[in-house]
């Protein structure tokens, strides 16, 4: 499965002849922390999952999506407080009886080792060391993310 950056690259190549792409905008907005090709923002207040989801939208961002175990570990390394929990963009879909990311994809069972039940009204939080299933109404902090946007450079052929 192609990453969003790879898909973007293919689209650009198809729509614009003689175009190259280089990684760009490697600076996150002020107050955001860069983690690889993402910018992360940690809240300083608490909210249920739905409110957290909505609040990230006000920052033109989304609740954190975690691609794999490696990204989880790198994110957890940014968490300084041992006992604090943060909502991420993953909740239990009752209709599909599976964990579903807010981008519509389902959790690969090998990606995260979730402590707790997979049931209705459950949402996923992370701490410095673990991943938990919590009632979505629980009031905790959250993490927003922005994807760093590739810069597109038009390369003109020699005349």
């Amino acid at each position: 499965q192609k990453s969003s950056i790879e898909k973007c690259s293919v689209d650009i190549q198809q729509s614009r002849n003689k175009t190259t792409e280089r990684p760009g905008l490697l600076n996150c907005p002020i107050y955001w922390q860069q983690l690889r090709e993402k910018c992360l923002l940690f809240s300083h207040t608490v909210n249920p999952w739905n409110n957290s989801l909505a609040d990230c939208s006000t920052k033109e961002s989304s609740l954190l999506l975690i691609r794999d175990k490696d990204e989880l570990i790198h994110t957890q390394n940014l968490i300084r407080d041992k006992a604090i929990l943060f909502w991420i963009g993953l909740n239990f879909s009752l209709s599909e009886k599976n964990w579903k990311w807010i981008n519509g994809s389902f959790l690969n069972s090998n990606d995260l080792e979730i402590r707790g039940d997979a049931k209705e009204n459950s949402c996923i939080s992370i701490s410095q060391t673990s991943v938990y299933s919590e009632y979505c109404s629980t009031e905790i902090r959250w993490i927003c993310q922005k994807e760093l946007t590739p810069v597109r450079n038009k390369v003109y052929p020699d005349s």
């Epitope: 002020i30 107050y31 923002l41 940690f42 809240s43 300083h44 207040t45 608490v46 909210n47 249920p48 409110n51 609040d55 920052k59 300084r80 407080d81 604090i84 009031e139 905790i140 902090r141 927003c144």
Partner: antibody, heavy 120, light 107 residues
């Protein structure tokens, strides 16, 4: 303009409880998290905890976790901080302070302070 | 807990002087440092956030700098209304902590 108006001074005996109020005006009360900070006589500032008026969610400094309760009444745009089992070293000025941003920990507006004296 | 140590604790200066107050953190706090001014019997007033960003309405003679573990608040030319106590605060962790304060007095 933004204003946070706190309740008046209190004198309490050791072991008693005190409840301080903070009435907000000039902004959307549910749009900003409220914090409580105290200052003992001649001392520095100590953060006690926060309440999100929108949801009612709280988070307390572990030091006060067993003794503090923060609540709010959105109908009158008022936040409350109750501290129980008072001791003499709880004598301090208690401030409510508005969190300026959901994603940063600074306080942009403060109440005038409520003096709480704990004495037998 | 992250400790913040302010120096000096007391500072005597005259109107027109340039003064610098230092705040040292026991661990790296990035840029998550705030400065407040407090006058006797009053609540603290926000001056600077994120180590160097002046709050709206704060005069330009106040400036902040630093990152990591060492931060400074500078007042370029002291005015009579600037004599007060100044506090730094960190929010790199969710247990917000404050420095012990620097009392700025008239010489």
């Amino acid at each position: 303009q933004v204003q946070l108006v706190q309740s008046g001074a209190e004198v309490k005996k050791p072991g008693a409880s005190v409840k301080v109020s903070c009435k907000a005006s000039g902004y959307s009360f549910t749009g900003y998290t409220m914090n409580w900070v105290r200052q003992a006589p001649g001392q520095g500032l100590e953060w006690m905890g926060l309440i999100n008026p929108s949801s009612g969610g709280t988070y307390y400094n572990q030091k006060f976790k067993d003794r503090v309760t923060m609540t709010r009444d959105t109908s009158i745009s008022t936040a409350y901080m109750e501290l129980s089992r008072l001791r003499s070293d709880d004598t301090a000025v208690y401030y409510c302070a508005r969190l300026g941003d959901n994603y940063r920990g600074y306080f942009d507006y403060w109440g005038q302070g409520t003096t709480v004296t704990v004495s037998s | 807990d992250i400790q913040l140590t302010q120096s000096p604790s007391f500072l005597s200066a005259s109107v027109g002087d340039r003064v610098t107050i230092t705040c040292k953190a026991s661990q790296d706090v990035g840029s998550a440092v705030v400065w407040y001014q407090q006058k006797p019997g009053k609540a603290p007033k926000l001056l600077i956030d994120w180590a160097s960003i002046r709050h709206s309405g704060v005069p330009s003679r106040f400036s902040g700098s630093g990152s990591g573990t060492e931060f400074t608040l500078t007042i370029s030319s002291l005015q009579p209304e600037d004599f007060a106590t100044y506090y730094c605060q960190q929010y790199s962790t969710y247990l917000y902590t404050f420095g012990g304060g620097t009392k700025l007095e008239i010489k």
